[in-house]
């Protein structure tokens, strides 16, 4: 059941990113580190970079509440088992600052791409009976 919940959480994050993409014009147009083409075993490290990025509401429109709630939900910490797996390869993974910086629209697109990849990896690891994803 934990594995199913994990998958639900990852898919929920994809939906949150989709919702935020509707509000790109209401986000601070700041350039943020946006991992792309993340190498195998560095997915959790890249995920952490996306979570650390200072995505912010521009506080200009009426969508400030939903934007702030969504951003905060994107930063929900995965459990320590996943954090442990993240750490396993942290020495060989690029630092957050080394990734190309992109404006919010591309940042969110790349975040979604990573989440899709992690979701597929999780599915295939379950199919092959592995618990290590």
């Amino acid at each position: 059941q934990g594995q199913d919940r994990h998958m639900i959480r990852m898919r929920q994050l994809i939906d949150i990113v989709d919702q935020l993409k509707n509000y790109v014009n209401d986000l601070v147009p700041e350039f943020l580190p946006a991992p792309e083409d993340v190498e195998t075993n560095c997915e959790w490290s890249a995920f952490s970079c996306f979570q650390k990025a200072q995505l912010k509401s521009a506080n200009t429109g009426n969508n400030e509440r939903i934007i702030n709630v969504s951003i905060k939900k994107l930063k929900r910490k995965p459990p320590s088992t996943n954090a442990g797996r993240r750490q396993k390869h942290r020495l060989t993974c690029p630092s957050c600052d080394s990734y190309e910086k992109k404006p919010p629209k591309e940042f969110l697109e790349r975040f979604k791409s990573l989440l899709d990849k992690m979701d597929h990896q999780h599915l295939s690891s379950r199919t092959h009976g592995s618990e290590d994803s």
Epitope: R5, H6, D15, N22, N63, I66, V69, P78
Partner: antibody, heavy 126, light 106 residues
Framework: QVQLVESGGGVVQPGRSLRLSCAAS????????MHWVRQAPGKGLEWVAF????????YYADSVKGRFTISRDNSKNTLYLQMNSLRAEDTAVYYC???????????????????WGQGTTVTVSS | EIVLTQSPGTLSLSPGERATLSCRAS???????LAWYQQKPGQAPRLLIY???SRATGIPDRFSGSGSGTDFTLTISRLEPEDFAVYYC???????FGQGTKVEIK
């Protein structure tokens, strides 16, 4: 069982204050965001306020901003709504509701209000 | 801020009939963010559907939700006597409710 019980409603004059309470039981209160929602007589539902599970963020409807304050005491499993400068248009049944999206990664994941109290009536009248 | 418009305002049907309730958003809503509630007179609302199409715990399978973008639908396949109530859609995160659709006995 999972339960929310509101209290503190009553009749109050315009401009006065009132504090509503919502006692939670049957679940880990500190893992859930909480809402206040109201319903004026014969009208629809109106969201009033939300507080994050740890109290770190609070959000308010424009109609109550600056007058109402949502707070919580996780050690007492209780949610509060402090209502100041009350107006006739604040007359309503006030419900507390649990946000269905738990802070726990493996917890509940509903984007909705999944548990509701029975409501407490607030009447603002001179 | 997003506005949710529900239609029709009132739906007059007989038990056993199919009810189709509409909720239209003024801006695109990610399906995870759309919920439906049922409220009977003198009672608190009850969560029926979350994520546009997932039934909440204990909700009978005659209730189903669908839709994406700006158009969402709640369908009750065969109305039972206890289903006559007011139904609200809601956008999560802004927590805006639609104005409600009353399903009444014809």
């Amino acid at each position: 069982q999972v339960q929310l019980v509101e209290s503190g409603g009553g009749v109050v004059q315009p401009g006065r204050s009132l504090r509503l309470s919502c006692a939670a039981s049957g679940f880990t209160f500190s893992s859930y965001g909480m809402h206040w929602v109201r319903q004026a007589p014969g009208k629809g539902l109106e969201w009033v306020a939300f507080i994050w599970y740890d109290g770190s963020d609070k959000y308010y409807a424009d109609s109550v901003k600056g007058r109402f304050t949502i707070s919580r005491d996780n050690s007492k499993n209780t949610l509060y709504l402090q209502m100041n400068s009350l107006r006739a248009e604040d007359t309503a049944v006030y419900y507390c509701a649990r946000d269905g999206d738990s802070s726990d990664w493996y917890g509940d994941y509903y984007f909705g209000m999944d548990v509701w109290g029975q409501g407490t009536t607030v009447t603002v009248s001179s | 801020e997003i506005v949710l418009t529900q239609s029709p305002g009132t739906l007059s049907l007989s038990p056993g009939e199919r009810a189709t309730l509409s909720c239209r958003a003024s801006q695109s809503v990610s399906s995870s963010y759309l919920a439906w509630y049922q409220q009977k007179p003198g009672q608190a609302p009850r969560l029926l559907i979350y994520g546009a199409s997932s039934r909440a715990t204990g909700i009978p399978d005659r209730f189903s939700g669908s839709g994406s973008g700006t158009d969402f639908t709640l369908t009750i396949s065969r109305l039972e006597p206890e289903d006559f109530a007011v139904y609200y859609c809601q956008q999560y995160g802004s927590w805006t409710f639609g104005q409600g659709t009353k399903v009444e006995i014809k």
